[in-house]
């Protein structure tokens, strides 16, 4: 089931997923002046079997002015700068398969990709928050949000994070220990579709993953 809404917005914070659950869709959006190739995929889809998940379909953009030039998915350095992302991706890291079963890693950029990625998350997806540069994190609990299904409707849990305007930056899970307090998380948010094991694995992934693409907008 796709999540009906975006993850919550936290003032002066951005979020990212460490891995994407099967069923997640990423729209093939092109930057201004470019369009999807004729009969090109509308989106990439995280799919697979129990042992391997990968992104099906490939996004390709071509110049709106030319008719037959197809752009390959290999990004050029000058185009990377135009994306509103913090690029930290290691070339050694496999981009199609996450180490967590049933999940995909961040898809690699494609040439002339739009500045913002439109993701369609599925129930059980977890995203992690960090304060933007120049803001410091005050934790009341874990700085993550999970898309949950309750009474037939989807909703995101509220991340326990406040970003204050001090010149310090916070880190992602595993890079600092959040100061969780028992009263930090409301009672209604203690039951979670993502199992403890999922959370532990994802947190371990977050700690060990040196790299990831951090995107400013998900829809």
């Amino acid at each position: 089931e796709l999540c009906d809404d975006d993850p919550p917005e936290i003032p002066h914070a951005t979020f990212k997923a460490m891995a994407y659950k099967e069923g997640t869709m990423l729209n093939c959006e092109c930057k201004r002046g470019f369009r999807r190739i004729k009969s090109g995929s509308l989106y990439m889809l995280c799919t697979g079997n129990s042992s391997h998940s990968s992104w099906d379909n490939q996004c390709q953009c071509t110049s709106s002015a030319t008719r037959n030039t197809t752009k390959q998915v290999t990004p050029q350095p000058e185009e990377q700068k135009e994306r509103k992302t913090t690029e930290m991706q290691s070339p050694m890291q496999p981009v199609d398969q996450a180490s967590l079963p049933g999940h995909c890693r961040e898809p690699p950029p494609w040439e002339n990709e739009a500045t913002e990625r439109i993701y369609h998350f599925v129930v059980g997806q977890m995203v992690y928050y960090q304060c933007v540069q120049g803001y410091r994190a005050l934790h009341r609990g874990p700085a993550e949000s999970v898309c949950k299904m309750t009474h037939g409707k989807t909703r995101w849990t509220q991340p326990q994070l406040i970003c204050t305007g001090e010149m310090e930056t916070s880190q992602f899970p595993g890079e600092e220990k959040p100061q969780a307090s028992p009263e930090g998380r409301p009672e209604s948010e203690t039951s979670c579709l993502v199992t403890t094991t999922d959370f532990q694995i994802q947190t371990e992934m977050a700690a060990t993953m040196e790299t990831s693409i951090f995107t400013t907008e998900y829809q």
Epitope: L2, D4, D5, G23, N27, S39, Y43, D56, H120
Partner: antibody, heavy 117, light 104 residues
Amino acid sequence: QVQLVQSGAEVKKPGASVKVSCKASGYSFTRYWMHWVRQPPGQRLEWMGAIYPGNSDTSYSQKFEGRVTITADTSASTAYMELSSLRSEDTAVYYCSRDYGYYFDFWGQGTTVTVSS
Amino acid sequence: EIVLTQSPDFQSVTPKEKVTITCRASSSRSYMQWYQQKPDQSPKRLIYDTSKSASGVPSRFSGSGSGTDYTLTINSLEAEDAATYYCHQRSSYTFGQGTKLEIK
């Protein structure tokens, strides 16, 4: 529950245009691609195009490009497919369908368009 | 543009029989979808990602294949399975020409 309700049957003359509507309910309309697929009598299903109502991004089959326009009114949760310069070969049942990613999971009931002089 | 060719076009079968419908793609694809369409009805999803059953689909329906050749199998056919079956490729949104199943 998810429902896609299409407008009623149309009879058009060659050269005219037709606009078919698809009213969506029971889900977040702006977050799913909506496709239009047609089926001429006794023939295969044929993809015409799609729209992502969240940002009005569209994609059209090369066969229909230039003749088909797909739009969406997010305030009314309704998608539209307009086909111009109609000819007799455009006589078909026209379906809207929601894209779940893996497959088209919900379909409208179909709208019969007859092109006849 | 990818072309999907189904065989047979038409098959007349008796209840409880096993039915196999094949779909050949003009170029190698990673996954195939299958839809069922009964007379005067909208299509209904059956199989996705080649071999996964959509929710609510009876277990007698199964899919297999890879590369360019894919198969939809109906084990122990029932009268209600009389319909036209279409293979579908989601990256190009191409459909096969359909296989009509008639129950004897």
